[in-house]
Amino acid sequence: MMTGTIETTGNISAEKGGSIILQCHLSSTTAQVTQVNWEQQDQLLAICNADLGWHISPSFKDRVAPGPGLGLTLQSLTVNDTGEYFCIYHTYPDGTYTGRIFLEVLESSVAEHGARFQIP
């Protein structure tokens, strides 16, 4: 039975040209995290494999940095980066947990962080 929950940074906003950290945290389970995949609308951004380390997709090498931790840093943001991001935790023995983050990239200097929320 899957007992864990994913806590994410929720709905967030950032300024065009700036950077943002995408963070997820798996709690309430003793399952071992074997890999975390980061996706943007079905497109692979990065992989963090427990044994083999990080892979940043070639399409995003110039603008995505690994970390902090299992998180991901997006740099040189454009309005096209607005959208849904997913952290997919592969665990043993539980299986797969998925967290969702919505990022809005704003033209203006008004960019406020939304509240944190949990996805069971």
């Epitope: 890999q35 995949n37 996706e39 692979l44 992989i47 494999n49 044994d51 083999l52 380390g53 990080w54 892979h55 940043i56 070639p58 399409s59 090498k61 940095a65 690994p66 997919i88 592969h90």
Partner: antibody, heavy 122, light 113 residues
């Protein structure tokens, strides 16, 4: 010992499709990419695309994007490359290869299958 | 797409002599985060699949003799066979794996003079 074993040679008619398999063993299939490369007779190497089975992420060379489909079956540790609308220019040896593209190891295409000759002829 | 240009197309070298193959990419293959160049070299003998020799420009794959070495950075790379042996007769390919689509050089055929 890492091994990639491909399916046997195929003879196909123009306009038809071919599906080549690549069975992997000796490592954790989900953790590495499987890439597909072809080599026409007497020619160089041409990258077709790849798949990461631990998420079924695929990347294709634009040249083949409309005609190729790469899939993977984790239960059998087997990758597949299907090429449709075959023409005589597709006659080539098709190779699968394991890809290691992690930022701390990055060994590129480190193990290769034996190759599958696909002949397209009317 | 990144274009990989190899030179020469073919090379005849005496046994025991040095063979040098050049590879030029149309854009930099250096990844700033780990300071690695995503450039590999493969050896292919007739009727066989390619064999990985060197990755990340200069790291020899396990089991590859130390007479094979790679060098370069950014856009210019070199594969050197310090003392050619009969078993080194083959076609050599460079490949970039920095960005999609991954691309190969046209190949260099190494023969014995």
């Amino acid at each position: 010992e890492v091994q990639l074993v491909q399916s046997g040679a195929e003879v196909k008619k123009p306009g038809s499709s071919v599906k080549v398999s690549c069975k992997a063993s000796g490592y954790t299939f989900s953790n590495y990419w499987i890439g597909w490369v072809r080599q026409a007779p007497g020619q160089g190497l041409e990258w077709i695309g790849d798949i990461y089975p631990g998420g079924a992420y695929t990347n294709y060379n634009e040249k083949f994007k409309d005609r190729v489909t790469i899939t993977a079956d984790k239960s059998t540790s087997t990758a597949y490359m299907e090429l449709s609308s075959l023409r005589s220019e597709d006659t080539a040896v098709y190779y699968c290869a394991r890809g290691d593209y992690y930022d701390s190891s990055g060994r590129a295409m480190d193990y290769w299958g034996q190759g599958t000759l696909v002949t397209v002829s009317s | 797409d990144i274009v990989m240009t190899q030179s020469p197309d073919s090379l005849a070298v005496s046994l025991g002599e040095r063979a040098t193959i050049n590879c030029k990419s149309s854009q930099s293959l250096l990844y700033s985060r780990n300071q690695m160049n995503y450039l590999a070299w493969y050896q292919q003998k007739p009727g066989q699949p390619p064999k990985l020799l060197i990755y990340w420009t200069s790291t020899r794959e396990s089991g590859v003799p130390d007479r094979f070495s790679g060098s370069g950075s950014g856009t210019d790379f070199t594969l050197t066979i310090s003392s050619l042996q009969a078993e080194d007769v083959a076609v050599y390919y460079c490949q970039q794996y920095y960005s999609y689509p991954y691309t190969f050089g046209g190949g260099t055929k190494v023969e014995i003079k």
